[in-house]
């Protein structure tokens, strides 16, 4: 089937917004005013994986670049990168796993679960300007839960 | 060789709990999905939900409210429990193994149980 | 969720007949779409899996095609083991859907 998609960004649960640093990279930071614009749209596939009753599989690509989170063993450690892909065959609602996040909504708070990794999500650090990573604790100093804002196409 | 049995009791009493086992073989619960559907007699097959390899679980809505599945990887069995049944829960009670191919095939089903007739009746 | 319709609920054949069984599906479900065979006690065999595959050891006369919403079913030389009722399972998304079964009687 055609996968539905939605555009969107996301901030962490004190506000940081989401930025490219380096072509591969995307770090956390807050913005204000005309800074804003530099926060990264994502593309919100809802692809398939273990979907449950509270777990919505999604891929999160960003907009109108051929680059997908992706979640690999790097050193025995799961890690979150950006993966270039070939647009012609993405997205897809068949996903390879490691591009699968289950998308968990909590008390109006997002967190996305790698299926790759289960246990292990998308995190923030507390300090400014940190690079977005692959955490695998949940309720400690650093930030798991997101709010998504979505954005027209 | 990839093997399911139901197994739990032919008879339940309306208002009461039902209570299956699916046993498997051949595979390892922790790296495959299972489902459970049901078959009225002389009727179609309903799909009543799912237990994922990591222990997720997705419950068809009409039965959401009713229906619990769990498992227990060390003894290869997961297990089905519906609440407050009436005859309408009369029905053969299969349980299937998921294909659970990654960017292939995830949802689709290819081994299935003999099945287990339940009844509802006082 | 994805209704599955299909048709006919019931049909009559004879030995060496060519049958065919249609699925529609109420949203785009690609190629996945499976089909199953039942007979009388027995549990439903998969015949044909997701992308129209032939499960391994099932005859050729069995065999199926479609994509998007609309999807056929077809045996191409009935034989006297044929006669059994079959389904489609879409397998795009949860949850799972059935079609309502096909019988297929000796005429």
């Known amino acids: 089937a055609p996968v539905r998609s939605l555009n969107c960004t996301l901030r962490d649960s004190q506000q940081k917004s989401l930025v490219m640093s380096g072509p591969y990279e995307l770090k956390a930071l807050h913005l204000q005013g005309q800074d804003m614009e530099q926060q990264v749209v994502f593309s919100m596939s809802f692809v398939q994986g273990e979907e449950s009753n509270d777990k919505i599989p999604v891929a999160l690509g960003l907009k109108e670049k051929n680059l997908y989170l992706s979640c690999v063993l790097k050193d025995d450690k799961p890690t979150l990168q950006l993966e270039s892909v070939d647009p012609k065959n993405y997205p897809k609602k068949k996903m390879e796993k490691r591009f699968v996040f289950n998308k968990i909504e909590i008390n109006n708070k997002l967190e996305f679960e790698s299926a790759q990794f289960p246990n292990w999500y998308i995190s923030t650090s507390q300090a400014e300007n940190m690079p977005v990573f692959l955490g695998g604790t949940k309720g400690g100093q650093d930030i798991t839960d997101f709010t998504m804002q979505f954005v027209s196409s | 060789e990839v093997q399911l049995q139901e197994s739990g009791p032919g008879l339940v009493k309306p208002s009461e709990t039902l209570s299956l086992t699916c046993t498997v073989s051949?595979?390892?619960?922790?790296?495959?999905?299972v489902s459970w559907i049901r078959q009225p007699p002389g009727k179609g097959l309903e799909w009543l939900g799912l237990i994922w390899g990591g222990g997720d679980t997705y419950y068809n809505s009409p039965l959401k409210s009713r229906l619990t599945i769990s498992k227990d990887n060390s003894k290869s069995q997961v297990s089905l429990k519906l609440s407050s049944v009436t005859a309408a829960d009369t029905a053969v009670y299969y349980c299937?193994?998921?294909?659970?191919?990654?960017?292939?095939?995830?949802?689709?089903?290819?081994?299935w149980g003999q099945g287990t007739l339940v009844t509802v009746s006082s | 969720d994805t209704q599955v319709t299909q048709s006919p609920s019931s049909l009559s054949a004879s030995v060496g007949d060519r049958v065919t069984i249609t699925c529609i599906t109420s949203t785009d479900i690609d190629v996945d779409m499976n089909w199953y065979q039942q007979k009388p006690g027995k549990p439903p065999k998969l015949l044909i899996s997701q992308g129209n595959t032939l499960r391994p050891g099932v005859p050729s006369r069995f065999s199926s095609s479609g994509s998007g919403t609309d999807f056929t079913f077809t045996i191409s030389s009935l034989q006297p083991e044929d006669f059994a009722t079959y389904y489609c399972?879409?397998?795009?998304?949860?949850?799972?859907?059935f079609g309502q079964g096909t019988k297929l009687e000796i005429k």
């Open positions: 399972l879409q397998s795009d998304n949860l949850p799972l859907t």
């Open positions: 299937a193994k998921q294909r659970t191919l990654w960017g292939y095939d995830l949802y689709g089903m290819d081994y």
């Open positions: 051949g595979f390892s619960l922790s790296d495959y999905g």
